[in-house]
Structure formats: structure tokens, C-alpha cells
């Protein structure tokens, strides 16, 4: 920020490092909850046409895949990894890829991933080989 920019009162919008550099925000797919045809695949595209600038620079991309007796949905959003999402911690927020991990939710199959490269929640990965052997 140039010297003439006033100091931020609400620092949520401006993440800075020790040298005073400002973090560029993440670009994420952001369609909230949509019906999905993604099922029994190693990976899926989100089919979300909206790429949003995350509101706060500390936010990362998140995808949530849910299946119950009636339908399958895929949720794509930005979220602050310091805060739980759907009651779960975003433990993989620093990953460049969105590698789905199953979470325990009664009455449904629930997978969630988070990642921190541009539009990384567009390609959601279920395949175990990424979880274990892929260094990316």
C-alpha cells in the first residue's frame, strides 16, 4: 500500500507480513451449494462458472461434496482456515490441490477439501493415490 493510504481499522481485509507486504487474495470457485452429478469418480470438475475474489486475503478455497438418499451436492466457497467450516477444521488449507477427505456426518456421505492456489476447488480429487503418494 502506498504511504498515503490510511492505516486499516478493520484489519480483516488486509493481511500483512513482517515487512508490511500485502497479501493478494485467493481466487476461488464460489457457487455455494449446487446439485452435482459427480459420483464414483477419481476426480470431478465443479461445473461452477463463477470465480470469485475471496473477501479476505487469508481465505482459501473450499469444496464440500455431500451424498444422501435423495441427491448429491457440491458446495464451492471461500473460507478462513482459522475458522471451522461445517464444524470441521480446514487442516489441508495450505495444499495446492483440493484432495477430498471423508468426514463423519450422520445420514449422509460427506467429503471436504480446502486448498490455496487459484481456482483449486474447481478440480476436486477423491483418488487415494493423491492422498498418499503424490508429492504435489
Amino acid at each position: 500500500i502506498p504511504p498515503h493510504v490510511q492505516k486499516s481499522v478493520n484489519n480483516d481485509m488486509m493481511v500483512t507480513d513482517n515487512n508490511g507486504a500485502v497479501k493478494f487474495p485467493q481466487l476461488c470457485k464460489f457457487c455455494d451449494v449446487r446439485f452435482s452429478t459427480c459420483d464414483n469418480q477419481k476426480s470431478c470438475l465443479s461445473n461452477c462458472s463463477i470465480t470469485s475474489i475471496c473477501e479476505k486475503p487469508q481465505e482459501v478455497c473450499v469444496a464440500v461434496w455431500r451424498k444422501n438418499d435423495e441427491n448429491i451436492t457440491l458446495e464451492t466457497v471461500c473460507h478462513d482456515p482459522k475458522l471451522p467450516y461445517h464444524d470441521f477444521i480446514l487442516e489441508d488449507a495450505a495444499s495446492p490441490k483440493c484432495i477430498m477427505k471423508e468426514k463423519k456426518k450422520p445420514g449422509e456421505t460427506f467429503f471436504m477439501c480446502s486448498c490455496s492456489s487459484d481456482e483449486c476447488n474447481d478440480n476436486i480429487i477423491f483418488s487415494e493415490e493423491y492422498n498418499t503418494s503424490n508429492p504435489d
Epitope: I1, P2, T16, N19, A21, V22, K23, F24
Partner: nanobody, 124 residues
Amino acid sequence: EVQLLESGGGLVQPGGSLRLSCAASGSTFTEYRMWWVRQAPGKGLEWVSAIEPIGHRTYYANSVRGRFTISRDNSKNTLYLQMNSLRAEDTAVYYCAKQAPGEKWARRWDLDYWGQGTLVTVSS
């Protein structure tokens, strides 16, 4: 290196329109993703819109999507922001900023990254 200079701000009534420009001097404009960033009085930075150097793919904050349109003319080294249906909450100083490929941070006091800003006031 690229130096940035914004213009086009002013006073406008709610529902009105403005077009901001950001003129870049220097030969490397086409290497950068360009941003419009705003700061309302007493608030933090809000990253409003961005555009890629090649292909001109665009991105918007949810707060301005459908009202603001970012564009660039690489032959004129100029970035634009067309702002329609303006609201009181759009009142802010608007800055343009540049981002090199893969760059995660912008140096805070480096005017090579930021323009001086142009004030937009939306009021009746």
C-alpha cells in the same frame, strides 16, 4: 518497471455510473494481472476486481459482481473499471495494483505496485 496513475473519480448520485482509468507507464504492463482495490474511510482494503494480461479473463468480488466491469487495453497500457448502479457503500479511494505471475504479496510501501488512488463518492 510499471508506474500507475488512476483517474476518473468524483461525486456521483446513488444509481449513477463512473468509469475509472489507470494509466501504466512502462513496457511491461502486459506481464501483469491487474487489480482494482478500494479503501473506504476507516476501513481495510477490499479487492474489487482483477483481469488477466492474456485472454483478459476477469474476476470480481461478490459485492460488485454484475455492477462493475473491469477491462484493459494493452495497446494503450490502460486499465479500466466501469462502475454502474453505484451505492453509498461504494464510496472509497480506488487504487489499481499489479500482480506478477505467481506473486503472493505486494510490497506495502512500493509505489511501483500501487497507484496514488482516485476518490469515488456516492451521495445524494
